[in-house]
């Protein structure tokens, strides 16, 4: 059932990385527009992206107010040019999203190797502490500020001359690894939240190799 020429949204999907969170849906509108509402389980509905012809809505500003809440969104369909029109039940046609809990589900963004420094047969590799869109006292919090001990990093490293990879883990943003003197190594890191059941790992960082400008060498 529904209003003439109006179809309900479907395939409502949350796309979220480091808490930047967008709701996407189908279909591309033909003679209709959409409005999105978002709510916590116990809260009131808040409308966003009014009468849009887009099939996505950025809900980041709402979810970063409390990333540990569980959110539900719904997408309303209205006939273009007649947004007062309602469905057969006296309400606009709408579809609910799956529930979304940002703290447990947001994807971890691709990390970046900030620097590496070799001293003799040791290399210190430092990972950039990525900024999120979660605020505290008007400053953006880092991934570590939000996740704390839940967040670890895995380092993959290998000799430039071979393909055999070694791994190391840290619950800080620094690794101190042993290397063979005179050999060049390449590095890639991954952010991991071991306590999660979904979206536990980020994609690997871009590879950085010794002998390139990010690194420093000291005898």
């Amino acid at each position: 059932s529904g209003t003439t020429n109006t179809v309900a949204a479907y395939n409502l999907t949350w796309k979220s990385t480091n808490f930047k969170t967008i709701l996407e849906w189908e279909p591309k509108p033909v003679n209709q527009v959409y409005t999105v509402q978002i709510s916590t389980k116990s809260g009131d509905w808040k409308s966003k992206c009014f009468y849009t012809t887009d099939t996505e809505c950025d809900l980041t500003d709402e979810i970063v107010k409390d990333v540990k809440q569980t959110y539900l969104a719904r997408v309303f369909s209205y006939p273009a040019g007649n947004v007062e029109s309602t469905g057969s039940a006296g309400e606009p046609l709408y579809e609910n999203s799956p529930e979304f809990t940002p703290y447990l589900e947001t994807n971890l963004g691709q990390p970046t190797i900030q620097s590496f420094e070799q001293v003799g047969t040791k290399v210190n590799v430092t990972v950039e502490d990525e900024r999120t869109l979660v605020r505290r006292n008007n400053t953006f919090l880092s991934l570590r500020d939000v996740f704390g001990k839940d967040l670890i990093y895995t380092l993959y490293y290998w000799k430039s001359s071979s393909s055999g990879k070694k791994t190391a883990k840290t619950n800080t943003n620094e690794f101190l690894i042993d290397v063979d003197k005179g050999e060049n190594y390449c590095f890639s890191v991954q952010a991991v939240i071991p306590s999660r059941t979904v979206n536990r790992k980020s994609t690997d960082s871009p590879v950085e190799c010794m002998g390139q400008e990010k690194g420093e060498f000291r005898e």
């Epitope: 880092s142 001990k149 943003n173």
Partner: antibody
Framework: EVQLVQSGAEVKKPGESLRISCKGS????????IEWVRQMPGKGLEWMGD????????NYSPSFQGHVTISADKSISTAYLQWSSLKASDTAMYYC?????????????WGQGTLVTVSS | DIVMTQTPLSLPVTPGEPASISCKSS????????????LTWYLQKPGQSPQLLIY???TRSSGVPDRFSGSGSGTDFTLKISRVEAEDVGVYYC?????????FGQGTKLEIK
């Protein structure tokens, strides 16, 4: 209002099993770590372990690993601490606590404690 | 495990006077990525559950009076009470909130002279 309500005092004999509970309310139970802390009579605080109810992931202090089990039932917002075989040295006050909103920001809310007495 | 060492273990104070408690950790609690120190302070009043006073070494928890302040970095930390009141009596604990297992100091008992 955030609340952690713990089960009542228990008196047990050595070798018996026990499960005590901690029910959370006033917040999203699945996204905050529940911590368990022991305080033996007249002594200080000892961290035992914790659980993230949303995933069931646990961490234990090496001092308690293998002697206690931490679990949670997110459908009723309750975390548990259990022993399969109690010892007299388990006599203590046991507190549950909830982690803070930010990472590594302390144990922001505490239950009232459950006194466990183990004596033959 | 990180060992937390508090001094003094007993602290008799006259009401209205300042008080200071030291806490030293066996490893640095400073996280270089965001320059935060993951050191927490609690107060356990007689017959009560502990309560959070300060996290991130210097951030007061909501509702904690501003006479309480935390400072320090790395391995050396201090909790100060600018003017002690009768209700501040109890045992103060510092805690490593940086690394598992999360260890507590042995406690400092503040009493009124």
């Amino acid at each position: 209002e955030v609340q952690l309500v713990q089960s009542g005092a228990e008196v047990k004999k050595p070798g018996e099993s026990l499960r005590i509970s901690c029910k959370g309310s006033g917040y999203t139970f699945i996204t905050y770590w529940i911590e368990w802390v022991r305080q033996m009579p007249g002594k200080g605080l000892e961290w035992m372990g914790d659980i993230l109810p949303g995933s069931g992931s646990t961490n234990y202090s090496p001092s308690f690993q293998g002697h206690v089990t931490i679990s949670a039932d997110k459908s009723i917002s309750t975390a548990y601490l259990q022993w399969s075989s109690l010892k007299a040295s388990d006599t203590a006050m046991y507190y549950c606590a909830r982690s803070g909103y930010y990472g590594n920001s302390g144990f922001a809310y505490w239950g009232q404690g459950t006194l466990v007495t183990v004596s033959s | 495990d990180i060992v937390m060492t508090q001094t003094p273990l007993s602290l008799p104070v006259t009401p209205g006077e300042p008080a200071s408690i030291s806490c030293k950790s066996s490893q640095s609690l400073l996280y270089s990525g965001n320059q935060r120190n993951y050191l927490t302070w609690y107060l356990q009043k007689p017959g009560q559950s502990p309560q959070l006073l300060i996290y991130w070494a210097s951030t007061r928890s909501s509702g904690v009076p501003d006479r309480f302040s935390g400072s320090g970095s790395g391995t050396d930390f201090t909790l100060k009470i600018s003017r002690v009141e009768a209700e501040d009596v109890g045992v103060y604990y510092c805690q490593n909130d940086d690394t598992y297992p999360m260890t507590f100091g042995q406690g400092t008992k503040l009493e009124i002279k």
